[in-house]
Interface confidence: medium
């Protein structure tokens, strides 16, 4: 007769492992019992269970409640058992010993491999600011058995580096994604992709990039100088900038307080009907947690009665 088993049985943590053992006997041969034992190198054999055609399954105390026979129908020559709820400590060598009568005993070994799927975690790096050099955007760590694969999926240009730490029964892999922050990266997804034989599909964790920046400020509204004349209604100056976090705006007048009737509405400065007292140097101050910018313009309100020309200076400062 001959004994059939598998060289390796692979199971995911928490699943049931079927340990196969089938005796293909000659006619007239009987299987007296099937003994299962764990036989890791350097350690003595540890009995799991005995299977008997008449007396059924006898499980050793160390495996009580964890070893069962496969559900019926069962072939009398099938000595396979189920190891319930496999844990990492179950990984190792197992021996099936079939005692036939009168031919004697046959044994075969198999290796049980318990896959431990990773539970990945993504940790964002320090706050990203435009103007920084190469900076850590995020790190992704996954621990499993065998070692998982950790990669990145993103449109953002950057560099990756990985390191691995081996533990007694698993390995932790950490991958870091570095980039040179720029405002174009704002809102872009950075996805950590973890692959592992114990996963039905890759696990993905997405981090949205936030890059702090503040654009140069400029003031609109003085493009047509001739519109800024006494009596004109609805005149306004608008401060243009953008940033992350979104900036706040503040208007001041360099050569004195804001004239009465002038309304500040965020980035917009609204004027009542223009008079010569509205002439002056106006400053838009833009700021966020990252930086601040100033832009100033000179308003010269024309008197239509005068023929003299009007000059407008635009100055931008940061």
């Amino acid at each position: 007769g001959e004994l059939e088993t598998s060289d390796v049985v692979t199971v995911v943590l928490g699943q049931d492992a079927k340990l196969p053992c089938f005796y293909r006997g000659d006619s007239g041969e009987q299987v007296g019992q099937v003994a299962w034992a764990r036989v890791d190198a350097g350690e003595g054999a540890q009995e799991l269970a005995l299977l008997h055609s008449k007396y059924g399954l006898h499980v050793s105390p160390a495996y009580e409640g964890r070893v069962e026979q496969p559900p019926p129908p069962r072939n009398p020559l099938d000595g396979s058992v189920l190891l319930r709820n496999a844990v990492q400590a179950d990984e190792g060598e197992y021996e099936c010993r079939v005692s036939t009568f009168p031919a004697g005993s046959f044994q075969a070994r198999l290796r049980l491999r318990v896959l431990v799927p990773p539970l990945p975690s993504l940790n964002p790096g320090p706050a990203l600011e435009e103007g920084q050099g190469l900076t850590l955007a995020a790190s992704c760590t996954a621990e499993g058995s065998p070692a998982p694969s950790v990669t990145w999926d993103t449109e953002v240009k950057g560099t990756t580096s990985s390191r691995s730490f081996k533990h007694s029964r698993s390995a932790a892999v950490t991958s870091e994604f570095h980039l040179v922050p720029s405002r174009s990266m704002n809102g872009q997804p950075l996805t950590c992709v973890v692959s592992h034989p114990g996963l039905l599909q890759d696990q993905r964790i997405t981090h949205i990039l936030h890059v702090s920046f503040l654009a140069e400020a400029s003031v609109r509204g003085l493009e047509d100088q001739n519109l800024w004349h006494i009596g004109r209604e609805g005149a306004m100056l608008k401060c243009l900038s953008e940033g992350q976090p979104p900036p706040s705006y503040n208007w001041t007048r360099l050569d004195g307080p804001l004239p009465s009737g002038v309304r500040v509405d965020g980035d917009t400065l609204g004027f009542p009907p223009l008079t010569t007292e509205h002439s002056g140097i106006y400053v838009c101050h833009v700021s966020n947690e990252f930086s601040s910018r100033d832009s100033q313009v000179t308003v010269d309100v024309l008197d239509p009665q005068e023929d003299s020309g009007k000059q407008v200076d635009l100055v931008s400062a940061s």
């Epitope: 009987q30 299987v31 007296g32 019992q33 003994a35 009995e47 005995l50 008997h52 055609s53 008449k54 007396y55 006898h58 050793s60 009398p76 010993r97 005692s99 009568f101 009168p102 004697g104 005993s105």
Partner: nanobody, 115 residues
Framework: EVQLLESGGGLVQPGGSLRLSCAAS????????MGWYRQAPGKEREFVSA????????YYADSVKGRFTISRDNSKNTLYLQMNSLKPEDTAVYYC????????WGQGTQVTVSS
């Protein structure tokens, strides 16, 4: 060749004790469940007790539970049955058997319980 040789039988008074032995040869004793059976005159052979190859998990017929103890010594290839509180109805020929689907039997040893 498989051989099973029972010994230890005899005449005993009710309430007495006997210890049966079964010396096994011709096969790897430690690889098999072993059992004791008995057959009273004019009756069918009946199961008494069995034990796994490692010596754990003993099985007993209800009629002998608490009175009989099965054991084995794999280093000596020997099976034992300690019988206490014997009753007249325990009178029978006791057989040692290799517990495979079609049991292999010894020749038996006579146990008589009588006053």
């Amino acid at each position: 060749e498989v051989q099973l040789l029972e010994s230890g039988g005899g005449l005993v008074q009710p309430g007495g004790s006997l210890r049966l032995s079964c010396a096994a040869s011709g096969f790897t004793f430690s690889d098999y469940y072993m059992g004791w059976y008995r057959q009273a005159p004019g009756k069918e052979r009946e199961f008494v007790s069995a034990i796994s190859s490692t010596g754990g998990s003993p099985y007993y017929a209800d009629s002998v539970k608490g009175r009989f103890t099965i054991s084995r010594d794999n280093s000596k290839n020997t099976l034992y049955l300690q019988m206490n509180s014997l009753k007249p109805e325990d009178t029978a020929v006791y057989y040692c058997a290799v517990e495979v689907p079609y049991d292999y039997w010894g020749q038996g040893t006579q146990v008589t319980v009588s006053s």
